[in-house]
């Protein structure tokens, strides 16, 4: 396979269903903490979408840590049988659009938007900066694209396409893309490669948003950011399909992915935990 072929492969919904987290902490990286114990624990890996083993140091860390594989699965995975390919005339909203707005338990309040299923509109609320749920968007536009209905009863998706209510076909919306590229994937795909703080030299891939390709880099083994993938294919799956791209000799838009990419980004603003 050439690099170009690989980067233009369309990964279908059946191969990569939308990631819908049951709890925000399931998106946290495995964190062994600063202590030196060797304790077998489990965490949910958002890239492999599975619960995996890791070694916990015995103190601190985060909530993405479970005593058993079963507990991890119970908290962070959904039954694959629930992932039904949608063939109905009107695309359904993601489940999280129907969740109540959730400020979370922290107090670093920032403006976010949620879909109000009563008013059928995206509205502003104050998010505390941690936890909460996925009905939580950084912009009004993002919320509208994912959760609100379009004017003619179609669901506008997050990739500039709409489901045509007449013939059930996906119609590119050229008006949504003012520049050559517009990114609609996970926001971490736009971050630079980050080696992290340790001394290992692990082969990893990051998405280079400037050139629009996945590139190798050396990861130190700890720290860094979410733009960090164990394989090129995983990198492409997560980031490449987030681009809407104009075809060079025409006005149409080619959409790399014809479904919504669910947000799993966690806010890293300064936060203040409430006294429990």
């Amino acid at each position: 396979d050439s690099e170009e072929d690989e980067e233009h492969t369309i990964i279908t919904d059946t191969e990569l269903p939308p990631l819908k987290l049951m709890h925000s902490f399931c998106a946290f990286k495995a964190d062994d903490g600063p202590c030196k114990a060797i304790m077998k624990r489990f965490f949910f890996n958002i890239f492999t979408r599975q619960c995996e083993e890791f070694i916990y140091g015995g103190c601190e860390g985060n909530q993405n840590r479970f005593e058993s594989l079963e507990e991890c699965k119970k908290m962070c995975t959904r039954d694959n049988a629930n992932r039904i390919i949608k063939t109905t005339l009107q695309q359904e909203k993601p489940d999280f659009c129907f969740l109540e707005e959730d400020p979370g338990i922290c107090r670093g309040y920032i403006t976010r938007y949620f879909y109000n299923n009563q008013t059928k509109q995206c509205e502003r609320f104050k998010y505390g900066g941690c936890l909460g749920n996925m009905n939580n968007f950084e912009t009004l536009e993002e919320c509208k694209n994912i959760c609100e209905d379009g004017p003619n009863g179609f669901q506008v998706d997050n990739y500039g396409t709409q489901l045509n209510a007449v013939n059930n076909s996906l119609t590119p919306q050229s008006t949504k893309v003012p520049s050559l590229f517009e990114f609609h994937g996970p926001s971490w795909c736009l971050t630079p490669a980050d080696r992290g703080l340790c001394r290992a030299n692990e082969n990893r891939f990051y998405y280079n948003s400037v050139i629009g390709k996945c590139r190798p880099f050396k990861y130190s083994g700890c720290g860094g950011n979410e733009n960090n993938f164990t394989s090129k294919q995983e990198c492409l799956r997560a980031c490449k399909k987030g681009f809407i791209q104009r075809i060079s000799k025409g006005g149409l838009i080619k959409t790399k992915r014809k479904r919504k990419k669910q947000r799993v980004k966690i806010a890293y603003e300064e936060i203040f935990v409430k006294n429990m």
Partner: antibody
């Protein structure tokens, strides 16, 4: 017409408790986050707290956090403020106010007076 | 918390004359979404507060157009082009950009 009517105010001793109610009408109550705001005699306005549309989550001012609890019953179109460990400085007219889609208070009730005194 | 400071605290005006109230915030009220959540309330004597203006300059329905709001960042102004008898009361600015919501001390408008 949007209407918010508070009740339950009265005289209470320091350390005592009181429960205020706000009856809403003229709009779909469950669609809106709701607030309590208070106004001490001859003073300005102070935000007390907010409850989300479904009632699962609340925000509180530091001055009342841990003592006051906001709840709602969407089936009854009612908002509540449970006030415990009351202090003299909690003496005020308490207003309920609706939150609009911009997370801003748009409609206010007529208020109910709470007096904390021995 | 964001401190809201109104001036003057008392404003005696002549009927038919203009009036202006200033409101300053201790930090910018421009939110990360590009909007400025500065609002004005009117509280007539013996009544509950009523929203006049939201998002700096948007008039609530039923509010006469003699009221105008302006400003940006930390400095805001409420103007009444021609004061009428029904405008008597206390006017509060308040901000909804930062949590918790905070209010100005109020400006009492009275007829000379």
């Amino acid at each position: 017409e949007v209407q918010l009517v508070e009740s339950g105010g009265g005289l209470v001793k320091p350390g005592g408790s009181l429960r205020l109610s706000c009856a809403a009408s003229g709009f779909t109550f469950s669609s809106y986050a709701m607030n309590w705001v208070r106004q001490a005699p001859g003073k300005g306005l102070e935000w007390v707290g907010t409850i989300t549309t479904g009632g699962s989550y609340t925000y509180y001012a530091d001055s009342v956090d841990g003592r006051f609890t906001i709840s709602r019953d969407n089936a009854k179109n009612s908002l509540y403020l449970q006030m415990n460990s009351l202090r003299a400085e909690d003496t005020a007219v308490y207003y309920c106010a609706r939150q609009d889609g911009n997370f801003l208070m748009d409609y206010w009730g007529q208020g109910t007076l709470v007096t904390v005194s021995s | 918390d964001v401190v809201m400071t109104q001036t003057p605290l008392s404003l005696p005006v002549t009927l038919g004359q203009p009036a202006s109230i200033s409101c300053k915030s201790s930090q910018s009220l421009l939110d990360i979404d590009g909007k400025t959540y500065l609002n004005w309330l009117q509280q007539r004597p013996g009544q509950s507060p009523k929203r006049l203006i939201y998002l700096v300059s948007k008039l609530d329905s039923g509010v006469p157009d003699r009221f105008t709001g302006s400003g940006s960042g930390t400095d805001f102004t409420l103007k009444i082009s021609r004061v009428e008898a029904e405008d008597v009361g206390v006017y509060y600015c308040w901000q909804g950009t930062h949590f918790p919501f905070t209010f100005g001390q109020g400006t009492k408008v009275e007829i000379k």
